[in-house]
């Protein structure tokens, strides 16, 4: 890991390579409420008219070092009679999120932030724009 | 920013409180290619049968400052001929993200990492699973 | 503070399925993988596979695709493992844990679950 | 997958003893390696994360060092309560993998 000295005056901010060395706090990445979480059901993968299944996507030198990755199951989406509907597609939705990888020429836990696109779920789209009546 | 003095030599890791004191280079966080961000179809919120509107949550104190959030349009899906359907229920896929939030009450560029839960878009789900045959 | 409290010793036929539970309190179920593990004297532990109860996504060792299901049901916070056609090389200890997805690391275990197959 | 050989299979101290243990892996797995105490009847205790890093709660008696292929754990003055099997994994990707163990006995 990388310890910082903790000093008790901060640092100058005004240097041009700041961005290149701040200090982060691993340490308090659970804080996300446990009514949010729990309001999340884990099912919508299988129920949706867009299924999708996860894969667990590791990387040890990555913070998080696991992320699970949508992929769709199909190329259209299941109708109601539980059959695939050729006239609707089921596409992916993707989200880019921020992940922090070691910099493994540098200090075992010295990091650089990098940004990646992952799957999130699926949805089911038309070929065609139409709203709600 | 705090800036950490550089060694030539990679501080102790033996220390049990090394999660709370990482060194992060931010620079490279607009390194993503134009390309990877444009293979991300913004249409799909209208196109979809469950579809989304997307408002954007700021956050000066914040590593990203801005995120894009989804809200489902309608609490059912909209079918073929444009009509909401009462079977089918529209549901925001929600996904955990890491943000950097700056700690105010130590140095200004001192961040400490949070997770926090987005809606990414919306898939249509029926009340039962089915599976396409 | 964190438990993982699994279900007690099993005696099962040649040929059956049984399922092992594996219940979580002290933390946010959802936010947490939970991870099985078998041990045998010969053998040693032997890493099965995981379930995230929050997205419901699961990877199996491929030793074991075919011996073993997790599930999960978030309102009761119990994690599940169904271990099919059973065989004497089934009978082990079976143990769950948590595994920090950020951090990357297996923090808490179960006590284990004994299952001995026998005719 | 990574195997993690651990030697040695037991130890035979008297309290007030150092005691080390070692586990080699067979490719590297950086820093991501994990001691366990297992005491009968007990669930496994997270000792040591990260090669070197010790868990919250843990006596400073316990240590660990490493990175790479080649890991220690060691017990600074054994006491009569650490008589239980100690084991190390790799959390480096999975399968994840374990060593064999080492049944620490006390005279």
């Known amino acids: 890991a990388v310890l910082i000295p903790q000093s008790s005056v901060c640092p100058n901010a005004e240097a041009n390579n700041f961005l290149q060395n701040v200090k982060v706090n691993l340490k308090v990445i659970n804080s996300l409420s446990s009514k949010a979480s729990s309001r999340r059901p884990s099912d919508y993968l299988n129920r949706s008219t867009s299924p999708w299944t996860l894969s667990r996507n590791e990387d040890p030198d990555r913070y998080p070092s696991v992320i699970w990755e949508a992929q769709c199951r199909h190329q259209r989406c299941v109708n109601a009679e539980g059959k695939l509907d050729h006239h609707m597609n089921s596409v992916l939705i993707q989200q880019e999120i921020l992940v922090l990888k070691r910099e493994p020429e540098k200090c075992p836990f010295t990091f650089r932030v990098e940004k990646m696109l992952v799957g999130v779920g699926c949805t089911c789209v038309s070929s065609i724009v139409r709203h709600a009546s | 920013a705090v800036l950490i003095p550089q060694s030539s030599v990679c501080p102790n890791a033996e220390a049990n409180n090394f999660l709370q004191n990482v060194k992060v280079n931010l620079k490279v966080i607009n390194s993503l290619s134009s390309k990877a961000s444009s293979r991300r179809p913004s249409d799909y919120l209208n196109r979809s049968t469950s579809p989304w509107t997307l408002s954007r949550n700021e956050d000066p104190d914040r590593y990203p400052s801005v995120i894009w959030e989804a809200q489902c349009r309608h609490q059912r899906c909209v079918n073929a001929e444009g009509k909401l359907d009462h079977h089918m229920n529209s549901v925001l896929i929600q996904q955990e993200i890491l943000v950097l939030k700056r700690e105010p009450e130590k140095c200004p560029f001192t961040f400490r990492v949070e997770k926090m839960l987005v809606g990414v878009g919306c898939t249509c789900v029926s009340s039962i699973v089915r599976h396409a045959s | 503070q964190v438990q993982l409290q699994q279900s007690g010793a099993e005696l099962v036929r040649p040929g059956a399925s049984v399922k092992l539970s594996c219940k979580a309190s002290?933390?946010?179920?959802?936010?947490?993988?939970i991870h099985w593990v078998k041990q045998t004297p010969v053998h040693g532990l032997a890493w099965i596979g995981v379930?995230?109860?929050?997205?419901?996504?699961?990877a199996y060792n491929q030793k074991f695709k075919d011996k073993a299901t997790l599930t999960a049901d978030k309102s009761s916070s119990t994690a599940y493992m169904e271990l099919s056609s059973l065989t004497s090389e089934d009978s082990a200890v079976y143990y769950c844990?948590?595994?920090?997805?950020?951090?990357?690391?297996?923090?808490?275990w179960g006590q284990g679950t004994t299952l001995t197959v026998s005719s | 997958s990574i195997v993690m050989t651990q030697t040695p299979k037991f130890l035979l101290v008297s309290a007030g003893d150092r005691v080390t243990i070692t586990c080699k892996a067979s490719q590297s797995v950086n820093n991501d390696v994990a001691w366990y105490q297992h005491k009968p009847g007990q669930s496994p205790k997270l000792l040591i994360n990260y090669a070197s890093n010790r868990y919250t709660g843990v006596p400073d008696r316990f240590t660990g060092s490493g990175y790479g292929t080649d890991f220690t754990f060691t017990i600074s003055t054994v006491q009569a309560e650490d008589l239980a099997i100690y084991f190390c994994?790799?959390?480096?990707?999975?399968?994840?993998?374990f060593g064999g163990g080492t049944k620490l006995e006390i005279k």
């Open positions: 379930i995230h109860p929050g997205n419901g996504g699961t």
């Open positions: 002290g933390y946010t179920f959802s936010d947490y993988e």
């Open positions: 844990e948590r595994f920090l997805t950020y951090e990357g690391y297996f923090d808490y």
């Open positions: 994994q790799q959390d480096y990707g999975s399968p994840y993998t």
